[in-house]
């Protein structure tokens, strides 16, 4: 806490500029008007303030806006955002995607901090759902964002937003999350033709039921082994040898390398040896 002291003569700040970097902490507290700071927040990032000086500026904004900063200030916080606590951020009402982008840019290249997580939560709750533009922005900054959400939170993702999802965004999703996302993806991509549909739906297939895998097997999709290995075991088990052969296409020979791993192992054990022998891979049920 900086002690309240009168501003020395001639030091009263008329604008936020580089001369302020030479001010001691107490001088910043005494000589910089909080309202001036709020209107010229965009200048703060261009000035090499020390962490201690930034603490003073934050304190001034906190005093001016005890109920939480307005968006006009939040949008220009820049590196001052790193000084905010989750408790500070919970007071904010962030509605502009531009504001969100500006603050995510500050944290770019780092793990998602509690501050960023709180900011995103506030933003999404304010919007009511994860729309396409928001999802596009969040996954661009944090590819694992989608998989950090609970199945309940994912249920608020509208099918239209699925178009923004890239394969790498789903890398860390577990089966429960894919169970929620797959039906949305199926709906989102339903008007695409066979091969284009498969390219888009492939990353979500960890949530696909048996009947959808059977349907895909009739479409010359040539599913690769990496995708097959991520399918739900309960969805794979009812597939026949012929269906798996058609589903995998040329990739079917990769079953031999994966015969000890799930879901391949469990699937092999469910098949008749005569049927497995038709593959010519030497798979033993």
């Amino acid at each position: 806490e900086v002690e309240k002291t009168a501003c020395p003569s001639g030091k009263k700040a008329r604008e936020i500029d580089e001369s302020l970097i030479f001010y001691k902490k107490w001088e910043l507290e005494a000589c910089v008007d909080a309202a001036l700071l709020a209107t010229q927040m965009d200048r703060v990032n261009a000035i090499p303030f020390t962490y201690e000086q930034l603490d003073v500026l934050k304190h001034k904004l906190d005093e001016l806006y005890p109920q939480g900063y307005p968006e006009s200030v939040i949008q220009h916080l820049g590196y001052l955002f790193l000084k905010m606590s989750p408790e500070d951020i919970r007071k904010w009402n962030v509605t502009s995607l531009e504001t969100l982008k500006a603050l995510l840019e500050v944290n770019k290249g780092h793990e998602m901090s509690p501050q960023v997580a709180t900011l995103i939560d506030r933003f999404v709750k304010g919007r009511g759902q994860l729309d396409k533009d928001t999802l596009d922005t969040l996954t661009a900054f944090y590819p694992g964002y989608l998989c950090s959400l609970s199945p309940e939170e994912l249920s608020s993702v509208p099918p239209s937003s699925i178009w923004a999802v890239r394969p790498q965004d789903l890398d860390t999703c577990d089966p429960r999350q894919l169970d929620v996302l797959y039906p949305k993806a199926r709906l989102a991509f339903q008007n695409m033709n066979g091969s284009e549909y498969f390219v888009k739906i492939q990353s979500f297939l960890g949530g696909a039921p048996t009947e959808d895998l059977k349907a895909l097997s009739q479409q010359n999709v040539s599913m690769d082994l990496a995708t097959f290995m991520k399918l739900r075991t309960d969805a794979v088990l009812p597939l026949t040898v012929a269906e798996v052969q058609k589903l995998l296409g040329p990739h079917v020979e990769g079953l031999k390398a994966e015969e000890r791993h799930r879901p391949v192992r469990d699937w092999i054990l469910r098949q008749r040896q005569d049927d497995l022998d038709t593959l010519g891979l030497g798979l033993q049920g």
């Epitope: 040539s222 690769d224 082994l225 052969q245 296409g249 040329p250 990739h251 020979e253 990769g254 031999k256 390398a257 994966e258 593959l279 010519g280 891979l281 030497g282």
Partner: antibody, heavy 115, light 108 residues
């Protein structure tokens, strides 16, 4: 994206040796068979050799048996074709391909055996 | 080793024609037969695998069938980009592979 890139071709004298490489990306060669196929100038396709790393299986065409050796380094995701005692009739573009149903092929590397 | 005898070695056809190429195996074989298309200076491209399965992304005018030891590639309506050389190939897993001699499809 799946890609196969051959290298190591060139001009060699009869009786000489060459080692061709097939660098794979976008998939794991451990769980895939890799094949070498050659094509002499103006001629058709001729299978040369196959390897399945996961089952330690190798196979050769009669025309190269005892002279060529196929191998794979799964840590480098690369397959090789060591060609010894080369003959004029081995002159060809050499392709590597993935799977028995060869869904991806490299661009090919030219091997010329001539004195 | 199994031989694959491909016929004809060349044929002339017009755009829109139905084209059929046949490969006969020298002995009983499994359905592990594939068909490839190759254009000059390029690597072959897979069209059909397992005798009759259309490879992903290949136009549906291409089809494959089997009758005993005879394997057939059919192009239902020849397109300008289909003029090329076609090869059949047999090779069940863990067996030697053999290619047919090739069929060159030329413009009439």
């Amino acid at each position: 994206e799946v890609q196969l890139v051959e290298s190591g071709g060139g001009l060699v004298q009869p009786g000489g040796s060459l080692r061709l490489s097939c660098a794979a990306s976008g998939f794991n060669i451990y769980s895939s068979s890799i094949h070498w196929v050659r094509q002499a100038p103006g001629k058709g396709l001729e299978w040369v050799a196959s390897i399945s790393s996961y089952s330690s299986y190798t196979s050769y065409a009669d025309s190269v048996k005892g002279r060529f050796t196929i191998s794979a380094d799964t840590s480098k995701n690369t397959a090789y074709l060591q060609m010894n005692s080369l003959r004029a009739e081995d002159t060809a573009v050499y392709y590597c391909a993935r799977y028995y149903a060869m869904d991806y092929w490299g661009q090919g590397t030219l091997v010329t055996v001539s004195s | 080793d199994i031989q694959m005898t491909q016929s004809p070695s060349s044929l002339s056809a017009s755009v829109g024609d139905r084209v059929t190429i046949t490969c006969r195996a020298s002995q009983s074989v499994s359905s592990a037969v594939a068909w490839y298309q190759q254009k000059p200076g390029k690597a072959p491209k897979l069209l059909i695998y397992s005798a009759s399965s259309l490879y992903s992304g290949v136009p549906s005018r291409f089809s494959g069938s089997r009758s005993g030891t005879d394997f057939t590639l059919t192009i239902s309506s020849l397109q300008p980009e289909d003029f090329a050389t076609y090869y059949c190939q047999q090779g069940p897993y863990y067996h030697p592979i053999t290619f047919g001699q090739g069929t060159k499809v030329e413009i009439k």
